[in-house]
Every structure is written in structure tokens, then in C-alpha cells.
């Protein structure tokens, strides 16, 4: 007998063929003798079964012998041997439907599981192999799991059902809630105006929660919360702030936050968290803030950095268009008796300039500016 | 949601052949049969044939046969329709639509082909 | 070919009026029709399927009967979207056939 394999929710259409390419009478039944369609004339009727209102046929093929059978909004217990009777012979074909879903929400957070249950008809034994967007395969029966769920999980998986040699294919789209970078840092000079930024990985219509922004200063000996605010359908609304620093942001996605001005004693590591609506745990974005100052007091010419910067990390005190007077990987250093001209204080790594800070010194009878 | 998208605006010269595409999205392309239909600026509707992409198998109307072919690509979920020896009251906008079992839905946005010299 | 054949070509209405337009078979085709609306510049949609039977989303004031070779679209009160050119379509056989149109315009 021939075997269809469907999709729970989709359409299927079991084939029945007439040897005479003309409209004859036909009956389809299931396995318990009861009728499911067929034909008066040119009229289709029904039978009793429970797939009268999702039963239907083409009836344009009946001309041409062919009397099929259209199953709509397929169900597990759709799965049965189905009989079409035409021309005193009987054709039977097996009928498996089978359902492929996630276990609770298609959206989840970043480090969360992924299982996939596969529902199917008794006495099947269908095997089940997946591909996530990023290539990775994975195998099973009647539960498929994938643990600690990464951003390149995002996207569509194909999974295929395989049972009695025929197979069926699945589309799942699945989106990993997360901040598209993990951990970002910042350079910037005493004085400067800092901006933070916290783009999101995925795009959902609405978007509700509540974040805080938790920093913990280079100088201090306790994170400290910066802010807190509330997200509403996309609409960013602060609901406290510290006085110092006040920080400002955006009413807009993505989040975006302002500080007035990078000082030493701000420099440090964030944490901001954002916690969405129905949904359990958090979603984390790290950030650094390195700040650098240069200053000339009496005889000495002084460059300092503030805030998580890498051992790898090369500081350099030098003249304008003359070789480094001095580079070390430290988060100071210094020029004694510097000769008059505009010095640069360089942050760099592995050659590339992160920060960079001018400071203009005079000769000794004045006192030095800062452009 | 079930979604049927047509390739643009084609501007062709008697003789000639055009392949229009048609690509599905949001159900299981193989499970429907895909028809195209045309209709002549200000002028009705016209059936021209079927493809079940499940099969293969295909339907002309007569009057379309031998200058019509419905293909499918299943990987890309895409059906065409190439007409050949194109002549100026080809001109037309040709849709394609999906069988929803003996009737037309739902419909693509349809493509204009211009057949002209 | 079955041909079909509708009533009027077109006609004038107002909003909230009854209108009624028919389809003639040159065959018999039981109850194998199908309503179309078109809007200009837009793709048909299916109204009526079966003869009788509203598709899913469409306004209950849009019905159809008949059966054999008479059918009727009957929209109860029409509304300004009705605004249209209605088509009816056989599927008893193939080719299938469209009939001509029928376009609703504002009175």
C-alpha cells in the first residue's frame, strides 16, 4: 500500500486513478468502512466521518479519471489507511501525519534551550534530523534538544521527519533574544561626551520590559546602579537616574545612553541588564569605559588612563612627528623636563591607535595649554 | 502568512519568449497545485494552465498549448511560467495563484508584460 | 469550453444599496463556482467558493447561490470598498473558464 507522510495544519491530497479518463462514481473511505466523499453526477457528497468540513476534491480531474482525495487542516489522528473505491477495485493508501513544535516560545534568550517535540501517530517510528541556521545537525526521536542557545541560532531550522523511506520536512523560525555584542568598550578623553550604545540582535513588533545600567568604577569599592528605566512598545522611559553622573537616553530603540563627560572617576565596567516581558531570565550587555588624561605640573609631563584596559595594552608619551619618548604597557607614564612642542599621549594596540590625547608644552618661562 | 510574490515588469518583442517567477512563502510549496491566470489591460480573466509541484504534472488550456510551460523549482520554492512566440496581444498582466482545492487563493501581485516592437 | 456569462457588465449604486449580479453556465456545473472581487491595479481575491460558501475574513453582507447553470452574488448593503469588478469562475472542468465581469461603480 502506498504510504503519504503530511504536516499537522497543512493539506495533503491522496491520488486515486481511474483507468477509464472519464467522470465515474468513486467513494473514498477510511479504514473503518465509513464514507468520506464522493460523487452524485457532477455533485460532491459527503459522508459521515469527522473530516466532512475538511474533505474536498478536484473536481476538474474527474473528466480525466482521476478522483482525489484533498484533506485540510491535517490532524494527528488524520493518520489512518484510506480506501478509494472506483471501477469494482479499491486502492488504499496509509496516511501519517506528524507535528514538529517548540517547546514553549519560538523567541528565546540567548543561553536558554531549544527542544523540539515531535508529535506522531501510534505505531510510527519516525526518526528526526535538524539543521540550524548555522549548519549544526542534530539528531533524535521524539524530542530533539539544544542546549545553551547561541545568537547564530537565530533563523529558520529545517528538520526531516523520515518514516518508511519518505520524508517530511519541517520549517521552524526561531529568534535568540540577545544584544548583538556581548561586551563593547569605550575610549575616550577627560571631557569628552560618551556615548553608549546597546543595539539588539532581533526586531519584534512590540517590545515591552525594564532594564538597569549597574557600573562598577575603577575607584570605587561597590557597583553602583546608574539608572533604571522602562521599555513600552518600543518607547524608552527613564524611571531613576544618580545624580552623579546623570546620565541621559534615548526614547528610541536601539538603547542609547549619554554621559556628559568621561572623568577618571567614572572609568570602569557596566553591566547593563534588560528584562523582557513573559519571558524568564535576563539579557546582559557588558561595557567598559577607558579614560585618559594628560597633564603637565611643574617639570612633569604626565599621561594616565583610568578604567579595564588590556596588559597588552601600550601607552606612549612622544613629540609631534619624533619617536616615542617613552611606551610601556602600564597605566602611566611620564616625561620629565619635556622640551617645548605638542606632545601626544597614545593608547595603543598591536600598532592601532585607540586613544589619542594632545597637550601643548611651552617653554619653561610659561605655563602649558591644552588645546 | 501565505504569501505569493511575481517578478517585475518584462518588456518583450514579437517573437520572443518571457519566464515570469512566482515565489511562495508561509505554507509547504509541493502541497498546492499553482495556476496562472492573465488578464489584458481592461479585459477579463484568463486561465492559462496548473502545475502540482508535487508531481510535476501539468495542465494547458488549449489555447496556450505549445507556447506555454509551467515549471516549479521546489528548492527555492518558486514557480514559472514561460510563454513563447510572444505576439502584441500577449501584452498583459500575468498572475499566478495558488489552488486552494478547485478555486483561486491566494493571488500574486501580478506582472505586466509589455509585447512590443 | 464552458462558457460563463454574467449580468450586468456593470452597474451604478449606491452605498447601502442591495446589488445583485448573475452568472450563467452554458453547462450544467452543479455548484462549482467560485466569486472573485477586483479592485483596480490589485489581484483578484476569492469571495465566494462552492456556490455558497463565504471564504474565511470576507463580510457576511457577500452571499451566493444557484446551482446548475444560475448563480447570483448578492452583496446586502454595499459599502464604499465594494467598489469593484466582480468575476465568477467554474471548476467542473478544464479549461477552467471566467466569466466576463461585472463592475459596481458609484452611482
Known amino acids: 500500500k502506498k504510504v503519504v507522510l503530511g504536516k499537522k495544519g497543512d493539506t495533503v491530497e491522496l491520488t486515486c486513478t481511474a483507468s477509464q479518463k472519464k467522470s465515474i462514481q468513486f467513494h473514498w473511505k477510511n479504514s473503518n468502512q465509513i464514507k468520506i466523499l464522493g460523487n452524485q453526477g457532477s455533485f460532491l457528497t459527503k459522508g459521515p466521518s469527522k473530516l466532512n468540513d475538511r474533505a474536498d476534491s478536484r473536481r476538474s480531474l474527474w473528466d480525466q479519471g482521476n478522483f482525489p482525495l484533498i484533506i485540510k487542516n491535517l490532524k494527528i489522528e488524520d493518520s489512518d489507511t484510506y480506501i478509494c473505491e472506483v471501477e469494482d477495485q479499491k486502492e488504499e493508501v496509509q496516511l501519517l501525519v506528524f507535528g514538529l513544535t517548540a517547546n514553549s516560545d519560538t523567541h528565546l534568550l540567548q543561553g536558554q534551550s531549544l527542544t523540539l517535540t515531535l508529535e506522531s501517530p501510534p505505531g510510527s517510528s519516525p526518526s528526526v534530523q535538524c539543521r540550524s541556521p548555522r549548519g549544526k545537525n542534530i539528531q533524535g526521536g521524539k524530542t530533539l534538544s539544544v542546549s545553551q542557545l547561541e545568537l547564530q541560532d537565530s533563523g529558520t531550522w529545517t528538520c526531516t521527519v523520515l518514516q518508511n523511506q519518505k520524508k517530511v520536512e519541517f520549517k521552524i523560525d526561531i529568534v535568540v533574544l540577545a544584544f548583538q555584542k556581548a561586551s563593547s568598550i569605550v575610549y575616550k578623553k577627560e571631557g569628552e561626551q560618551v556615548e553608549f550604545s546597546f543595539p539588539l540582535a532581533f526586531t519584534v513588533e512590540k517590545l515591552t520590559g525594564s532594564g538597569e545600567l549597574w557600573w562598577q568604577a575603577e575607584r570605587a569599592s561597590s557597583s553602583k546602579s546608574w539608572i533604571t528605566f522602562d521599555l513600552k512598545n518600543k518607547e524608552v522611559s527613564v524611571k531613576r537616574v544618580t545624580q552623579d553622573p546623570k546620565l541621559q537616553m534615548g526614547k528610541k530603540l536601539p538603547l542609547h545612553l549619554t554621559l556628559p563627560q568621561a572623568l577618571p572617576q567614572y572609568a570602569g565596567s557596566g553591566n547593563l541588564t534588560l528584562a523582557l516581558e513573559a519571558k524568564t531570565g535576563k539579557l546582559h550587555q557588558e561595557v567598559n569605559l577607558v579614560v585618559m588624561r594628560a597633564t603637565q605640573l611643574q617639570k612633569n609631563l604626565t599621561c594616565e588612563v583610568w578604567g579595564p584596559t588590556s596588559p597588552k595594552l601600550m601607552l606612549s608619551l612622544k613629540l609631534e612627528n619624533k619617536e616615542a619618548k617613552v611606551s610601556k604597557r602600564e597605566k602611566a607614564v611620564w616625561v620629565l623636563n619635556p622640551e617645548a612642542g605638542m606632545w601626544q599621549c597614545l593608547l595603543s594596540d598591536s600598532g592601532q591607535v585607540l586613544l589619542e590625547s594632545n597637550i601643548k608644552v611651552l617653554p619653561t618661562w610659561s605655563t602649558p595649554v591644552q588645546p | 502568512q501565505v504569501q505569493l510574490v511575481q517578478s517585475g515588469a518584462e518588456v518583450k518583442k514579437p517573437g520572443s519568449s518571457v519566464k515570469v517567477s512566482c515565489k511562495a512563502s508561509?505554507?509547504?510549496?509541493?502541497?498546492?497545485?499553482i495556476h496562472w491566470v492573465r488578464q489584458a489591460p481592461g479585459q477579463g480573466l484568463e486561465w492559462m494552465g496548473w502545475m502540482n509541484p508535487n508531481s510535476g504534472n501539468t495542465g494547458y488550456a488549449q489555447k496556450f498549448q505549445g507556447r506555454v510551460t509551467i515549471t516549479a523549482d521546489e528548492s527555492t520554492s518558486t514557480a514559472y511560467m514561460e510563454l513563447s512566440s510572444l505576439r502584441s496581444e500577449d501584452t498583459a498582466v500575468y498572475y499566478c495563484?495558488?489552488?486552494?482545492?478547485?478555486?483561486?487563493?491566494?493571488w500574486g501581485q501580478g506582472t505586466l508584460v509589455t509585447v512590443s516592437s | 469550453d464552458i462558457q460563463m456569462t454574467q449580468s450586468p457588465s456593470s452597474l451604478s449604486a449606491s452605498v447601502g444599496d442591495r446589488v445583485t449580479i448573475t452568472c450563467r453556465a452554458s453547462?450544467?456545473?452543479?455548484?462549482?463556482l467560485a466569486w472573485y472581487q477586483q479592485k483596480p491595479g490589485k489581484a483578484p481575491k476569492l469571495l465566494i467558493y462552492d456556490a455558497s460558501s463565504l471564504q474565511s475574513g470576507v463580510p457576511s453582507r457577500f452571499s451566493g447561490s444557484g446551482s446548475g447553470t444560475d448563480f447570483t452574488l448578492t452583496i446586502s448593503s454595499l459599502q464604499p470598498e465594494d467598489f469593484a469588478t466582480y468575476y465568477c469562475q467554474q471548476a467542473i472542468s478544464f479549461p477552467l473558464t471566467f466569466g466576463g465581469g461585472t463592475k459596481v461603480e458609484i452611482k
Open positions: 495563484a495558488r489552488d486552494w482545492p478547485n478555486w483561486f487563493d491566494p
Open positions: 508561509g505554507y509547504t510549496f509541493t502541497n498546492y497545485y
Open positions: 453547462q450544467d456545473i452543479s455548484n462549482w
